[in-house]
């Protein structure tokens, strides 16, 4: 029998400077592209090697991005979220939610809706 899987959720403000090739990550999610069941939030799906996000080191695949330069990402269409990042300017402030899996008891399995899969 599997033990209970809990998640430690923390928030962090990450300030990135757009590099020569941009911010350097991919996103999934949005009201028209729900990635996690019952959650239309925006998640980081890929950090590009040697990009601004990778060099900074704090943003991780699976992180949920709550806001960009203070603008909430709730209830946005996927393409609108992409456009928001693309038009965010040179200095970009991200409010992100990290979700760290904490194992209690025997080894469990990651849930179907976990964005880090």
């Amino acid at each position: 029998m599997n033990g209970r899987v809990d998640y430690l959720v923390t928030e962090e403000e990450i300030n990135l400077t757009r590099g020569p090739s941009g911010l350097g990550f991919n996103i999934v999610g949005g009201t028209d592209q729900q990635y996690v069941s019952n959650d239309s939030g925006i998640y980081v799906s890929r950090i590009k090697e040697n990009g601004a996000a990778a060099l900074d080191g704090r943003l991780q695949e699976g992180d949920k991005i709550l806001s960009v330069n203070g603008q909430d990402l709730k209830n946005l269409l996927h393409q609108d979220a992409v456009d928001l990042f693309r038009n965010a300017g040179y200095a970009v402030s991200l409010r992100v939610q990290h979700r760290l899996q904490v194992q209690n008891g025997p080894i469990g399995h990651r849930g179907e809706g976990d964005p880090s899969g």
Partner: nanobody, 125 residues
Framework: DVQLVESGGGLVQAGGSLRLSCVAS????????MGWFRQAPGKEREFVAH??????DYADSVKGRFTISRDNAKNTMYLQMNSLKPEDTAVYYC?????????????????????WGQGTQVTVS
């Protein structure tokens, strides 16, 4: 990981048509950004077509002849190739990136993609 399997290649006469398919594993297919590339003998791998969440794009050499599409319910991407020419002869590869880049997308750059299929041979005589 994502597995990609291409099919539909073959030998066709100039002016003919083929439809390539690329089946991708994974429950989040609809979040994939996808592309077709090709590589002729002795040449570099070159971009053919791309399909994102809300856009498509084509190499100039195939515009008006090739059409890229996807069926999210079947986890499949297609490349309909019409009016084929001998210079279209190559191994055709499908490629996938997870999600949409937040930067201006250089979708013709193979480095933008995370996963690649094994390829399917197209020969136009």
């Amino acid at each position: 990981d994502v597995q990609l399997v291409e099919s539909g290649g073959g030998l066709v006469q100039a002016g003919g048509s083929l439809r390539l398919s690329c089946v991708a594993s994974g429950r989040t297919f609809r979040t994939y950004t996808m592309g077709w590339f090709r590589q002729a003998p002795g040449k570099e791998r070159e971009f053919v077509a791309h399909i994102g969440w809300s856009s498509t794009d084509y190499a100039d050499s195939v515009k008006g002849r090739f059409t890229i599409s996807r069926d999210n319910a079947k986890n499949t991407m297609y490349l309909q190739m019409n009016s084929l020419k001998p210079e279209d002869t190559a191994v055709y590869y499908c490629a996938v990136a997870i999600g949409s880049p937040v930067d201006s997308y250089r979708h013709s750059d193979p480095l933008e993609y995370d996963y690649w299929g094994q390829g399917t041979q197209v020969t136009v005589s």
